[in-house]
Amino acid sequence: ELCDDDPPEIPHATFKAMAYKEGTMLNCECKRGFRRIKSGSLYMLCTGNSSHSSWDNQCQCTSSATRNTTKQVTPQPEEQKERKTTEMQSPMQPVDQASLPGHCREPPPWENEATERIYHFVVGQMVYYQCVQGYRALHRGPAESVCKMTHGKTRWTQPQLICTGEMETSQFPGEEKPQASPEGRPESETSCLVTTTDFQIQTEMAATMETSIFTTEYQ
């Protein structure tokens, strides 16, 4: 089941999936002046069996001189700011994916790829947040969001992260001591079925992650 929306936006923060659950789709998008080849894949799909997961299909871009199908509206400054949290990050993958069955690693870049990636996440996907450079993380709880199925609808949990404007960068997923907050996550779960997976294994994995995956973008 695809998640209805993107993960929540946190001011002055970016989010990143460390691995992608089977069923995740990635748009085959091309940079300005290029378009997807006519016979090429429309998207990449994370598929697999019990022992191995990988991305099906390959994205390919070609010059769009023949037909202008890659027009891009130049974003206004406020729109650029709005998009900042979801701009494509470096595809380096410091995690050994063997430790997370049923997941794909970040796909490598393809030639003339767009500078932003749009993933279509599935229920159970977890993403992790980090404050952008120049902001410091104040945690009230986990700096992560999970796509859950509740009452037949999908929603993302709200990450408990506030990024303050002190000129200091915290370590990912956060070297700051959590603020005293015994209540944990704010959302109250009702008695209906909530579909989530992989919480524990992904949380443990996140503790080993490096900050560098958040700090590089494609030029």
Epitope: D5, Y43, I118
Partner: nanobody, 123 residues
Framework: EVQLVESGGGLVQAGDSLRLSCAAS????????LAWYRQAPGKEREFLAA???????LYADSVEDRFTISRDNPKNTVHLQMDNLKPEDTAVYYC?????????????????WGQGTQVSVSS
């Protein structure tokens, strides 16, 4: 609640052009494709074109040389420029929004539909 409102339909002569617009509201459409379909009397609803947030496009072979889809993300609108119209283009044209990447979604599987706008092409 999601709303898709089409505009721009009408009666034109063969060979003329027409530009349809669709205003989408009620949610973020960043991870949705916006698409155009049409349905002629007595026929099934037919996929025409789709576009992603980053302007990746897909066209039905039947209209690829004459129709152009475009998207204005700040305004949450999608347009369909139709050139060199033919009498067989006469139909009700529908705007659609669907989760996921650009792909030719079968009409029964589309998440959201507009109410449609009539396009009539006389010879």
């Amino acid at each position: 609640e999601v709303q898709l409102v089409e505009s721009g339909g009408g009666l034109v002569q063969a060979g003329d052009s027409l530009r349809l617009s669709c205003a989408a509201s009620g949610r973020s459409f960043r991870n949705y494709i916006l698409a155009w379909y049409r349905q002629a009397p007595g026929k099934e609803r037919e996929f025409l074109a789709a576009i992603s947030w980053l302007d990746g496009t897909l066209y039905a072979d039947s209209v690829e040389d004459r129709f152009t889809i475009s998207r204005d993300n700040p305004k949450n609108t999608v347009h369909l420029q139709m050139d060199n119209l033919k009498p067989e283009d006469t139909a009700v044209y529908y705007c659609a929004a669907d989760r996921g990447p650009v792909r030719p979604v079968l009409a029964p599987d589309v998440d959201y539909w507009g109410q449609g706008t009539q396009v009539s092409v006389s010879s």
